[in-house]
């Protein structure tokens, strides 16, 4: 089979600070040295890119400085963290993995992780 399987959790609940973490694991059909990982958000039928990073196997995953994502990699597993989430960001987050080099190229699309974000209640005023 030439398809690349990507696994990710079905559901994740963001923290009260709007941070969600999940693992994206891929079954590499070949020995890739350069991998690109992209987080996509699917809302209705619209798909948008949340963040993306390319990394060399054995090296750290580096997102752009202004990215809302951070991550670490270990073998065929990527630990992804998305920050700054609000309730309106609740949705399906898809992990996309591309084995860029060496040939052949492979594409892997996960089934998506439903991230639930609940905005914290504002703290009531308190008298001291």
């Amino acid at each position: 089979c030439k398809a690349m399987h990507v696994a990710q959790p079905a559901v994740v609940l963001a923290s009260s600070r709007g941070i969600a973490s999940f693992v994206c694991e891929y079954a590499s059909p070949g020995k890739a040295t350069e991998v690109r990982v992209t987080v996509l958000r699917q809302a209705d039928s619209q798909v948008t890119e949340v963040c993306a990073a390319t990394y060399m196997m054995g090296n750290e995953l580096t997102f752009l400085d202004d990215s809302i994502c951070t991550g670490t990699s270990s073998g065929n597993q990527v630990n992804l963290t998305i920050q700054g989430l609000r309730a309106m960001d609740t949705g399906l987050y898809i992990c996309k993995v591309e084995l860029m080099y060496p040939p052949p190229y492979y594409l892997g699309i996960g089934n998506g992780t439903q991230i639930y974000v609940i905005d914290p209640e504002p703290c009531p005023d308190s008298d001291f």
Epitope: K2, A3, R36, T48, K96, P104, L107, I109
Partner: antibody, heavy 118, light 108 residues
């Protein structure tokens, strides 16, 4: 408007060269991998070449390997195909196509005709 | 290389009838990586279905895709006059990207 517009096709003699261009507009070009696909008269679709986001990685069909070179200029939102040592069997309509975020080719240009004949 | 074989080569159908097109892969293709395109004479291909069964933006619901592994199907439930065209399947999970040879749907 989101679109791709090819140019550079024409009539060329066997052994000659041609450079095709594809101008992208209406989307963030650097966020997408791109392809060239061709279609010989009365025939089906044939994938020709692929280029990664930053242009560092390129893949080619065996039929064009060593003769065609794909490149991109993200600053100019443009994709290119340099075709050398052209043969009669390279005669086709050449399309540039965008890879959607989920993988299929969701945006195509109108095509440019390349005819290789003496 | 994954070889995609489409059948039939030509399908003659009357408007309003159902059309069923087949695409068989030489080896297993993940259902996430199979697409269908429509092409009319003188026009560029248009994406219809991706991920084997998801309709692309703006595609009417009379088009549906199904299948997994090596066998995939495109079904047009009720053919409209504008549906008479050539249809191609494609796998995009690994290089080289490959297309089927096409099925022409013509008016009976």
């Amino acid at each position: 408007e989101v679109q791709l517009v090819e140019s550079g096709g024409g009539l060329v003699k066997p052994g000659g060269s041609l450079r095709l261009s594809c101008a992208a507009s209406g989307f963030t070009f650097s966020s997408y991998t791109m392809h060239w696909v061709r279609q010989a008269p009365g025939k089906g679709l044939e994938w020709v070449s692929f280029i990664s986001y930053d242009g560092n990685h390129k893949y080619y069909a065996d039929s064009v390997k060593g003769r065609f070179t794909i490149s991109r200029d993200n600053a100019k939102n443009s994709l290119y195909l340099q075709m050398n040592s052209l043969r009669a069997e390279d005669t086709a309509v050449y399309y540039c196509a965008r890879t959607s975020l989920l993988g299929p080719f969701d945006l195509w240009g109108q095509g440019t005709m390349v005819t290789v004949s003496s | 290389e994954i070889v995609l074989t489409q059948s039939p080569g030509t399908l003659s159908v009357s408007p309003g009838e159902r059309a069923t097109l087949s695409c068989r892969a030489s080896q297993s293709v993940g259902s996430s990586y199979l697409a269908w395109y429509q092409q009319k004479p003188g026009q560029a291909p248009r994406l219809l279905i991706y991920g084997a069964f998801s309709r692309a933006t703006g595609i009417p619901d009379r088009f549906s895709g199904s299948g997994s592994g090596t066998d995939f199907t495109l079904t047009i439930s009720r053919l409209e006059p504008e549906d008479f065209a050539v249809y191609y399947c494609q796998q995009y999970g690994s290089s080289p990207w490959t297309f089927g040879q096409g099925t022409k749907v013509e008016i009976k």
